[in-house]
Interface confidence: low
C-alpha cells in the first residue's frame, strides 16, 4: 500500500508509518513498527506531560521557590503542572507566576482601593474631600473626617487627605 | 553617597551578545527597590527593558520578554544580558533604581549609561 | 496595552514664557504619573511624580497636572536651562507593557 504522507489526530508519522501518540501523563520509549504499537511509560514522580506526545523525556514540575515568596496553589498530577502562587502580602509578576513582588503600600493622602490578591497589586486612590489617610498601608482605605457636629464639638482644624479634622469645644458666651 | 553606574557596553558585530553590569553603591539592593534597565537609541526616545525586585521577581517589557534577560548577581550587582544582538540594539543603556512602596513606580536615581553599538 | 501617548513632540517658546505637555494614557491610571528632563548626554532626571509632586530640588516653575488618562506638565517663567527633551511615565503598572514612557517632547526656548 502507498505510505501515509499524513496521520490522524494522536498519531504522528515517522519511517513512513502513522504511530499512536502517547497519553496525557506517559513518555515515548520506542516508536511503533510494521509489528508493535508505540510503547509508553508513565511519567515518575514530580514530572508529567500535558497532552498527547511523542517526548522521549517527562517535563519537571514547577518548583515553587519559597525563597522567591512563592508556595503551592495546586499540586501537580502526571498530567498537570504544580500551580504556584505568591505568599501573603507578595503579588506575582506574570500570569506564568515564576517569581513575587511585595505589594504596594498606599501613601499618606492616598486609600486602598482594590487590596493586592495573589496576582495582581494593590490599586489605590487619592482621599477625596471628606476623608483622609495618615499611614502607608497595603489594606487601609481613606477615612472619612471626624463628624464634629455629632459630638457637640466645633472643628478648630480643617482636615486634609492626610489627616483628620480637630474637633474642640464650642465657645460659650459668658453671662 | 548613592550612585549607580553601568559598565560592560561595547562596539560588537550583530549576532554577538553582550552582559551589561549595573553596579549601585550607598545603597543595598536587598532593600525594597526595583532596579530597571531602560535603553535610548541615537535621537531617540525611552524605552523601558524591565525590572527585578530585590527577591529576583521581574518584570519585562513585552517585546523584551524571553529576548533580555535581567539577573541580580549579588547584592550591590544587576546584569542585562543580551543575546543575538542586532542594529536595532544600538542605545544607550541605563539603570534606574525604583521605589515601591511608595503607592507608584518611578526611577527616582539613574546611572550615566554605557553605549552598545551594534554594526558589521 | 498601556500605552503613554505625549503630546506636542517639539514646542518652542520664548524665556520667560510659558509652555505645556500634554500626555494621554490609553487607560485609566489614577494619579499614578511622572515627569522627567533629559539633556543631551545626561540620564534622565525625576522632576514630579503622583502627578503633581514636586522630586526634591526641583523649581515651582514646574507643575504637574490631572488624573485618570489624562495629564499636563506647564513650564512657567522659561529659561534657556529649561530647554531639553521631557517624557512622561506611567507608574501604574509593570504588567503587560510595551514602554512605561511617553515619546517625548522636545523643548527650545529662543
Known amino acids: 500500500p502507498e505510505p501515509p504522507t499524513a496521520c490522524r489526530e494522536k498519531q504522528y508519522l515517522i519511517n513512513s508509518q502513522c504511530c499512536s501518540l502517547c497519553q496525557p501523563g506517559q513518555k515515548l520509549v520506542s516508536d511503533c513498527t510494521e509489528f508493535t504499537e508505540t510503547e509508553c511509560l508513565p511519567c515518575g514522580e514530580s514530572e508529567f506531560l500535558d497532552t498527547w506526545n511523542r517526548e522521549t523525556h517527562c517535563h519537571q514540575h514547577k518548583y515553587c521557590d519559597p525563597n522567591l515568596g512563592l508556595r503551592v496553589q495546586q499540586k501537580g498530577t502526571s498530567e498537570t503542572d504544580t500551580i504556584c502562587t505568591c505568599e501573603e502580602g507578595w503579588h506575582c509578576t506574570s500570569e506564568a507566576c515564576e517569581s513575587c513582588v511585595l505589594h504596594r503600600s498606599c501613601s499618606p493622602g492616598f486609600g486602598v482601593k482594590q487590596i493586592a490578591t495573589g496576582v495582581s497589586d494593590t490599586i489605590c486612590e487619592p482621599c477625596p474631600v471628606g476623608f483622609f489617610s495618615n499611614v502607608s498601608s497595603a489594606f487601609e482605605k481613606c477615612h472619612p473626617w471626624t463628624s464634629c457636629e455629632t459630638k457637640d464639638l466645633v472643628v478648630q482644624q480643617a482636615g486634609t487627605n492626610k489627616t483628620d479634622v480637630v474637633c474642640g469645644p464650642q465657645d460659650r458666651l459668658r453671662a | 553617597q548613592e550612585q549607580l553606574e553601568e559598565s560592560g557596553g561595547d562596539l560588537v558585530k550583530p549576532g554577538a551578545s553582550l552582559t551589561l553590569t549595573c553596579k549601585a553603591s550607598?545603597?543595598?539592593?536587598?532593600?525594597?527597590?526595583?532596579m530597571c534597565w531602560v535603553r535610548q537609541a541615537p535621537g531617540k526616545g525611552l524605552e523601558w527593558i524591565g525590572c527585578?525586585?530585590?527577591?529576583?521577581?521581574t518584570y519585562y517589557a513585552s517585546w523584551a520578554k524571553g529576548r533580555f534577560t535581567i539577573s541580580k548577581t549579588s547584592p550591590t550587582t544587576v546584569t542585562l544580558q543580551m543575546p543575538s544582538l542586532t542594529a536595532a540594539d544600538t542605545a544607550t543603556y541605563f539603570c534606574?533604581?525604583?521605589?515601591?512602596?511608595?503607592?507608584?513606580?518611578?526611577?527616582?536615581?539613574w546611572g550615566p549609561g554605557t553605549l552598545v553599538t551594534v554594526s558589521s | 496595552a498601556l500605552v503613554m501617548t505625549q503630546t506636542p513632540s517639539s514646542v518652542s517658546a520664548a524665556v520667560g514664557g510659558t509652555v505645556t505637555i500634554n500626555c494621554q494614557a490609553s487607560?485609566?491610571?489614577?494619579?499614578?504619573l511622572s515627569w522627567y528632563q533629559q539633556k543631551p548626554g545626561q540620564p534622565p532626571k525625576l522632576l514630579i511624580y503622583?502627578?503633581?509632586t514636586l522630586a526634591s530640588g526641583v523649581p515651582s516653575r514646574f507643575k504637574g497636572s490631572g488624573s485618570g488618562t489624562q495629564f499636563t506638565l506647564t513650564i512657567s517663567d522659561l529659561e534657556c536651562a529649561d530647554a531639553a527633551t521631557y517624557y512622561c511615565q506611567q507608574g501604574y503598572t509593570y504588567s503587560s507593557v510595551d514602554n512605561v514612557f511617553g515619546g517625548g517632547t522636545e523643548v527650545v526656548v529662543k
Open positions: 534606574a533604581r525604583d521605589i515601591v512602596g511608595d503607592n507608584i513606580y518611578y526611577f527616582n536615581f
Open positions: 527585578i525586585y530585590a527577591t529576583g521577581g
Open positions: 503622583l502627578a503633581s
Open positions: 550607598g545603597f543595598d539592593l536587598s532593600s525594597t527597590y526595583y
Open positions: 487607560q485609566t491610571i489614577s494619579n499614578e
